[in-house]
């Protein structure tokens, strides 16, 4: 039988579950641990102080807890401050906590003291420098000033002037005496140890405002933008460069050591990037506002004024046009221009158009045209309808035929086709 059916092995409300190995296992509720949930969870009471993380474990049938402490705390329940948090150990010494709860510093060589802040004077502890070398204490260490003929950190080696070579920048060392040497420097360097880069710029050939930049046994010329080449003697064709040296449609012309732009109307400046202020020379009349445009200007007129320069009285102010007409002012002479709505004509749009007398009859199917103010009406003949008598009236729509007769629409009338046994206009 499955192990969980045989009376639950789990105590304290633990839930029995069967493992793939067919063994029983208990899923314990909060507060209980152990194989059969038989032990009280020591973490349940929150034994870890602060933000310590509690972990419980069962060892030999006993439930225990351990606390993982946050930075700055220690102890079994994270209640003790960490003395290492304040970094009390100097010079990279390693900090640890002693049995008394205080910090301990493991000092690096050359330092001593509780916090490793005191320098060890190695020159007082014995004689570290050999062959009569002078010991010089340094923070955390010491160095030896060796007498002639000796070298090495402790003056322990007899000196060979070219081993290692004191010559820098690829210079070749040549021993010239027991303790002396000469450096044969590569071109472009000088000095006892070839440590000096010769300044190649005196007498340079940078032309046209080029700046000399010293290199190793050479120099380079930094050219102004108008010149290029090794010595800044080559003209830059600015007109071939991208983006174009002349803006806003200006035409570029290369010159020796520069370029010039011929600007299109409305633009100015060395690269045609300045819009000419046409309002500077504009003559908008008093009260008008000038707006600059490219190669032109626009005068915004105050009420009652019109024209390109707002120099004309606006004839539309007096409402000379008939209602529904649109009034515009002629910008040249200031006169009103009335745009008439349909059905009206004349300078002020106050004359009715007789639609019945101009051209063909607007009414279809011999309808009679009647002129009205601003429009016309059509009086339709029998059988037609619509604004222009364009629609044939369907007399069958009212269903005049009776007794399942078929209705045939005719112009201005209808005909009923009767079923057998019926007669009359409506087959009634």
């Amino acid at each position: 039988a499955p192990p969980c059916l045989d009376g639950s092995p789990c105590a304290n409300g633990g839930r029995c579950t069967q493992l793939p190995s067919r063994e029983a296992a208990c899923l314990c509720p909060p507060g209980w641990v152990g194989e059969r949930c038989q032990l009280e969870d020591p973490c349940h009471s929150g034994p870890c102080a602060g933000r310590g993380v509690c972990q419980s474990s069962v060892v030999a049938g006993t439930a225990r807890f351990s606390c993982r402490c946050p930075r700055g705390f220690r102890g079994p329940d994270c209640s003790l401050p960490d003395p290492c948090l304040s970094s009390p150990c100097a010079h990279g010494a390693r900090c640890s906590v002693g049995p008394d709860g205080r910090f301990l510093c493991s000092c690096p060589p050359g330092y001593q003291g509780r916090s490793c802040r005191s320098d060890v004077d190695e020159c007082r502890v014995g004689e570290p420098c050999r062959h009569g070398g002078t010991c010089l204490n340094t923070p955390g260490s010491f160095r030896c000033q060796c007498p002639a003929g000796y070298t090495g950190p402790l003056c322990e080696n007899p000196a060979v002037p070219c081993a290692p070579s004191p010559c820098r920048n690829g210079g070749t060392c040549r021993q010239s005496g027991d303790l002396t040497y000469d450096c044969a420097c590569l071109p472009g360097f000088e000095g006892q140890n070839c440590e000096v880069n010769v300044d190649d710029c005196p007498g340079h050939r940078c032309l046209n405002g080029g700046t000399c930049v010293d290199g190793v046994n050479t120099y380079n010329c930094q050219c102004p933008p108008e010149w290029t080449g090794q010595f800044c003697t080559e003209d830059v064709d600015e007109c071939q460069l991208q983006p174009n040296a002349c803006h806003n449609g200006g035409t570029c012309f290369n010159t020796l050591g520069g370029h010039s732009c011929v600007c299109v109307n409305g633009w100015t400046g060395e690269s045609c990037s300045q819009n000419i202020d046409d309002c500077a020379t504009a003559v908008c009349f008093h009260g008008a506002t000038c707006h600059d445009r490219v190669a032109s200007f626009y005068c915004a007129c105050p009420m009652g004024k019109t024209g390109l320069l707002c120099h004309l009285d606006d004839a539309c102010v007096s409402n000379p046009c008939h209602e529904d007409a649109i009034c515009d002012t002629n910008p040249v002479n200031g006169r009103a221009i009335c745009t008439c709505p349909p059905g009206f004509t004349g300078g002020a749009c106050d004359q009715d158009v007789d639609e019945c007398s101009i051209g063909a009859n607007p009414c279809e199917h011999l309808g009679r045209c009647v002129n009205t103010q601003g429009s016309f009406l059509c009086q339709c003949g029998r059988g037609y309808t619509g604004p222009r008598c364009e629609t044939d009236v369907n007399e069958c729509l009212s269903g005049p035929c009776r007794n399942q007769a078929t209705c045939l629409d005719r112009i201005g009338q209808f005909t009923c086709i009767c079923m057998a046994g019926f007669t009359g206009t409506y087959c009634e």
Partner: antibody
Framework: EVQLLESGGGLVQPGGSLRLSCAAS????????MSWVRQAPGKGLEWVSY????????YYPDSVKGRFTISRDNSKNTLYLQMNSLRAEDTAVYYC?????????????WGQGTMVTVSS | DVVMTQTPLSLSVTPGQPASISCRSS???????????LHWYLQKPGQSPQLLIY???NRFSGVPDRFSGSGSGTDFTLKISRVEAEDVGVYFC?????????FGQGTKVEIK
């Protein structure tokens, strides 16, 4: 016909001044960059000054810098060379030349030249 | 300054025979942007110079096709395939890659 005609040459004492002119005809003078080139008696050619089409850009080799000034009057189709502090080595035939294109700087039209003699 | 050296300095040629003039510059005439600005001029006796070849090998309008130019870098050549009597004069090479623009000392061509 495209033509350049120099004038203004003559005999001048060392330290003196002279102004050469070059009258252009047969082409749109204001559309071309111009230069002066000189040729000492029996010697080669030496470029002495340059001016752009609008006159805004000029250039001189070290041999004449600070002493010669090139200018132009496009309304008169004329190129000028003002020569000050003249020296014996400035003795030469002076030609004005037209630059065919401002990308390659060669001379496609030359004047017939005017002789400048600097002597005491 | 760029020094232009022409060889030979004088040349005596039989009409109908070819002629060749060499021009060497003291530094490369290849402009940073790739073009080579080497030109040839002819100064006929008692006249001003006239353009023959521009940009190494381009014949100027009206120049007979017996004239040709070649070369690159610092070495350039002007060739006349069949010399004619009207070809006498002094031939100058010239560079406009570097300022100041400079000319060769000239090669005098005469007819035998």
């Amino acid at each position: 016909e495209v033509q350049l005609l120099e004038s203004g040459g003559g005999l001048v004492q060392p330290g003196g001044s002279l102004r050469l002119s070059c009258a252009a005809s047969g082409f749109a003078f204001s559309h071309y960059d111009m230069s002066w080139v000189r040729q000492a008696p029996g010697k080669g050619l030496e470029w002495v000054s340059y001016i752009s089409r609008g006159g805004g850009s000029t250039y001189y080799p070290d041999s004449v810098k600070g002493r010669f000034t090139i200018s132009r009057d496009n309304s008169k189709n004329t190129l000028y060379l003002q020569m000050n502090s003249l020296r014996a080595e400035d003795t030469a035939v002076y030609y004005c030349g037209r630059h065919a294109t401002t990308a390659y700087w060669y001379f496609d039209v030359w004047g017939q030249g005017t002789m400048v003699t600097v002597s005491s | 300054d760029v020094v232009m050296t022409q060889t030979p300095l004088s040349l005596s040629v039989t009409p109908g025979q070819p002629a060749s003039i060499s021009c060497r510059s003291s530094q490369s005439l290849v402009h940073t942007y790739g073009n080579t600005y080497l030109h040839w001029y002819l100064q006929k006796p008692g006249q001003s110079p006239q353009l023959l070849i521009y940009k190494v090998s381009n014949r100027f309008s009206g120049v007979p096709d017996r004239f040709s130019g070649s070369g690159s870098g610092t070495d350039f050549t002007l060739k006349i395939s069949r010399v004619e009597a009207e070809d006498v004069g002094v031939y100058f090479c010239s560079q406009s890659t570097h300022v100041p623009w400079t000319f060769g000392q000239g090669t005098k061509v005469e007819i035998k």
